[in-house]
């Protein structure tokens, strides 16, 4: 029986009856048995087919069989009922190897020309099985020249025996409060060969409840106890399970934070296994009951172990541990059953007693002492010298704990001084100076410090005054002496003042002319605003219109009168306003420099003489009544003037006030 | 972590005022909680002096509210103790804290004043 | 004022033994909410007082387990159970229930 070719030959090949092309001989027996390699299988067809028919091919035949399965028994030209020829059909070996008998009986009734087949070698695909059957791999199969190998989804691994799939199921950790765990791939079935190990693990005082929901299907065994798939579940305290069958288990207290579920299963079945719902529960606290005039939030049925609740207070009402204040409040429960935190009050704001008013006074309206949320209390200023600044004084305890203006201000009102009030009416004129009555001048001050000066009290704590009178002192503020309250220069009886600081105007130089010559004096101190203390007040955009030529302004000082003495009694004079060019010509004749009258300044005085300021009355101011206010203003400062105070065809040159209004507003602003 | 630090000066004459920065770190002082000032004096007597809340409202301890006064600026985290008119019964470790549901539960690592001529 | 006195003022011990602390308030320091603010400071040489105790018996963070406080009304205790060497200081007793609010005049815990 000849073998034919084995590997690793070339597998491939020509087959033929004994005589072919001619008739087979009777009596004829020929075997072959082809081996191709491994992974391999052969294939075989036939050209040329022409054996004696005969009843299930007993007597002439041609015998395909792989290993011990017989493939084909042939004969005839054409298929029958019973009988089987190859026809156009190919034959594949079972493995590797492929047997072919070829047997004649005793004898034919005509003659036959018998077969011719081809044969080679080719690759088998083990990734293509047969309807019903087992698949080669559990996930993917791959062929390949000789073979194939199998792989897996992610979250697997290919088990040892190549072929099957096996869970990565182990390692997972839950730490949640609650969550669902399941089988691998449920509800579809789960995968064989795996040892999946799952755990729960929560924070201690938690205990973890299980329960199995939906469909419970492990593999089972109806005399031993779960033998092939099996769901176990571990505990610091006990164990339960093996779990198996089709019923589902019942809820599962475990009264343990940390919980150990183990999945095992074997090589076959066919089975969806489970799925688990937990949820934990704990030590519940005491149900927290809102403070008055508070709400708790969340509201639940219990709080356990890290469930939390905040205290929100109504509007005008804050919250207070004790006597501490807290923004905000959020308890949590503990493992021992206890909030962490003691539960605050949520107590009326209190905005506390209002403060002082300097030069003013505050009066409740709710109630005597009353200081809680909305009520409310009234500033006001002391009458006649001050008047309040921005606002209506009504303020009210608002729920942050201010007190607070019908703006939004949280700043107490300003009882600003009011300036320009003057015992005095505008009497005739009168040559020379006259005796200041009490509260006639009350802005008047008087600056001693090397020599004497005036000036003229702005607000409460501000003087104004010409640079030249305190240009000695302004790196020594504080040498500066400033009386005021008082008529007599030389009386003990007068409000003494320091200054803080003096601010010369920037343009002003010394020695070099009068331009600029104006100063202002910070008092380190407030002061009390009365009678005979009062401020003069700042021009307004509309005070030239009191200012024109002719006008009467009035000066007032202690500077030297007729007698040639500092006067002991404050003096004032009452002089019109000079034409700017005709004063600019009186200062043009030698001994005076050109253009020593400048658009800073103004004249005032007669051409007659005889009215004028004096040396000790610089600084001074030179006050206008604005008759639309009633309010009497500063439109010029004491600056220079001619040799001879008083002079005929001479006039008192005056700082025009005027126009330094911004220069003024930014020092008293910015300081 | 919250971080309070005290500073000033060391000494102060008397009938002046003394005044003293706590600067704070880690924690704003306009998010929660009040803010003090506590002193201790030689021998160890501690006194509780006041606060300034997360709004900026205060309460001092009533023996001391003619010369104290506690502000703050909420730029640099940072509030203030002033108190006027000072004594040599005045000399004492300066120390700032915060509260929470507790007084005193994060504490500066204080400084020494020292009023004396 | 609330005056809070402690005894003894000077308490010397060894290592590992137990230390109880006593304060006593001058009138009831049960807050009108019901808290009773009742804390416990320890202060070492050179070192700002630490708060160990608030509300008469919760511990604040990071204290050691071996400190207690117990008490109500009045009367409170501070214990220590097994005396550490990091433990010698003085210890003050405060209330914060009325304003003002008040501290005791200290107690030293000394080794023997």
């Known amino acids: 029986t000849p073998l034919g070719p084995k590997w690793p030959e070339p597998v491939f090949g020509r087959l033929a009856s004994p005589g072919f092309p001619g008739e087979y001989a009777n009596d004829q027996e020929r075997r072959w048995t082809l081996t191709a390699p491994p992974g391999y299988r052969l294939r075989l067809y036939f050209t040329h087919f022409d054996l004696e028919l005969s009843h299930l091919c007993e007597y002439d035949f041609v015998k395909l069989s792989s290993g011990a399965k017989v493939l084909a028994t042939l004969c005839g030209q054409e298929s029958t009922d019973t009988e089987r020829a190859p026809g156009k059909d190919t034959f594949y070996s079972l493995g590797s190897s492929l047997d072919i008998t070829f047997r004649s009986d005793y004898s034919n009734e005509k003659p036959f020309t018998g077969f011719e087949a081809f044969y080679a070698a080719e690759d088998i695909d083990e990734c293509q099985v047969a309807p019903g059957e087992a698949p080669t791999c559990d996930h993917h199969c791959h062929n390949h020249l000789g073979g194939f190998y199998c792989s897996c989804r992610a979250g697997y691994v290919l088990h040892r025996n190549k072929r099957t799939c096996s869970a990565l199921c182990s390692g997972q950790v839950f730490t949640q409060r609650s969550g669902e765990l399941s089988s691998p791939e449920y509800p579809r079935p789960y995968p064989k060969l795996s040892s999946c190990t799952y755990s729960i693990s929560l924070e201690e005082g938690f205990s973890v409840i299980l329960d199995f929901v939906e469909s419970f299907d492990v593999e089972t065994h109806p005399e031993t106890l779960c033998p092939y798939d099996f769901l176990k579940i571990q505990t610091d305290r006990e164990e339960h399970g093996p779990f198996c069958g089709k019923t589902l288990p019942h809820r599962i207290e475990t009264k343990s934070n940390t919980v150990t579920i183990t999945f095992v299963t074997d090589e076959s079945g066919d089975h969806t296994g489970w799925k688990i719902h937990y949820t934990s529960t704990a030590q519940p606290c005491p149900y927290p009951m809102a403070p008055p005039n508070g709400h708790v939030s969340p509201v639940q049925a219990k709080y356990i172990l890290k469930d939390s609740f905040s205290i929100f207070c109504e509007t005008g009402y804050e919250l207070l541990q004790g006597h501490l204040p807290l923004k905000s409040f959020t308890a949590v429960c503990q493992k021992d059953g206890s909030w962490d935190r003691p539960m605050p009050a949520c107590s009326i704001v209190d905005c506390g007693p209002p403060d002082d008013l300097p030069s003013g006074r505050v009066e409740y309206i709710t109630g005597p002492g009353v200081t809680t949320y909305k009520a409310v209390i009234q500033y006001s200023c002391e009458e006649t010298f001050y008047t309040m600044k921005v606002n209506d004084g009504k303020y009210v305890c608002e729920a942050d704990g201010f007190w607070t203006s019908s703006k939004g201000e949280k700043s107490l009102p300003v009882c600003e001084p009011v300036c320009g009030l003057s015992a005095r009416t505008t009497g005739g004129r009168i040559y020379g100076g006259q005796k200041a009555k009490p509260g006639d001048f009350p802005w008047q001050v008087l600056i001693l410090g090397g020599t004497t000066a005036a000036g003229a009290l702005l607000y409460d704590n501000w003087v104004l005054t010409a640079a030249h009178a305190v240009y000695e002192q302004k790196h020594d503020a504080s040498a500066l002496d400033i009386r005021m309250g008082t008529l007599k220069r030389l009386s003990p009886h007068y409000t003494q003042a320091w200054s803080e600081a003096v601010f010369i105007h920037e343009g002003y130089t010394h020695d070099a002319g009068f331009d600029n010559d104006i100063a202002l004096i910070k008092l380190n101190n407030k002061v009390v605003i009365n009678s005979n203390i009062t401020p003069i007040c700042l021009p307004r955009k509309e005070a030239e219109s009191f200012m024109r030529t002719d006008d009467i302004g009035t000066a007032s000082g202690w500077g030297l009168t007729q007698r040639g003495f500092l006067a002991r009694n404050l003096m004032y004079v009452d002089i019109p306003i000079v034409d700017h060019q005709k004063c600019t010509a009186a200062y043009e004749k030698p001994p005076y420099p050109r253009g020593s009258v400048t658009a800073n300044m103004l004249c005032a005085g007669l051409e007659s003489g005889g009215k004028d300021s004096c040396r000790g009355d610089s600084g001074g101011a030179l006050v206008f009544l604005d008759s639309e206010t009633e309010r009497w203003f500063v439109g010029g400062i004491v600056s220079w003037g001619s040799m001879n105070c008083g002079e005929a065809g001479q006039y008192g040159v005056y700082t025009k006030v005027i126009n330094y209004i911004p220069w003024i507003e930014n020092i008293i602003s910015d300081f | 972590e919250v971080q309070l630090q005290e500073s000033g000066p060391g000494l102060v004459k008397p009938s002046q005022s003394l005044s003293l920065t706590c600067t704070v770190t880690?924690?704003?002082?306009?998010?929660?909680?009040?803010w003090h000032w506590i002193r201790q004096f030689p021998g160890n007597k501690l006194e509780w002096m006041g606060f300034?809340?997360?709004?900026?409202?205060?309460n001092y301890n009533p023996s001391l509210t003619s010369r104290i006064s506690i502000i703050r600026d909420t730029s640099k985290n940072q509030f203030f103790l002033q108190l006027n008119s000072v004594t040599t019964e005045d000399t004492a470790t300066y120390y700032c804290?915060?509260?929470?549901?507790?007084?005193?539960?994060?504490w500066g690592q204080g400084t020494l004043v020292t009023v004396s001529a | 004022n609330v005056l809070m006195t402690q005894s003894p003022l000077s308490l010397p011990v060894s290592l590992g033994d137990q230390a109880s602390i006593s304060c006593r308030s001058s009138?009831?320091?049960?807050?009108?909410?019901?808290?009773?603010?009742l804390e416990w400071y320890m202060q070492k040489p050179g070192q700002s007082p630490k708060l160990l105790i608030y509300?008469?018996?919760k511990r604040f963070s990071g204290v050691p387990d071996r400190f207690s406080g117990s008490g109500s009304g009045t009367d409170f205790t501070l214990k220590i159970s097994r005396v550490e060497a990091e433990d010698l200081g003085v210890y003050y007793c405060?209330?914060?229930?009325?304003?003002?609010?008040?501290f005791g005049a200290g107690t030293k815990l000394e080794l023997k």
């Open positions: 509300t008469v018996s």
């Open positions: 880690g924690f704003s002082i306009t998010s929660d909680y009040a």
């Open positions: 405060f209330q914060g229930s009325h304003v003002p609010v008040t």
């Open positions: 300034i809340n997360y709004s900026g409202r205060t």
């Open positions: 009138q009831s320091i049960v807050h009108s909410n019901g808290n009773t603010y």
């Open positions: 804290a915060r509260s929470y549901d507790f007084w005193f539960g994060y």
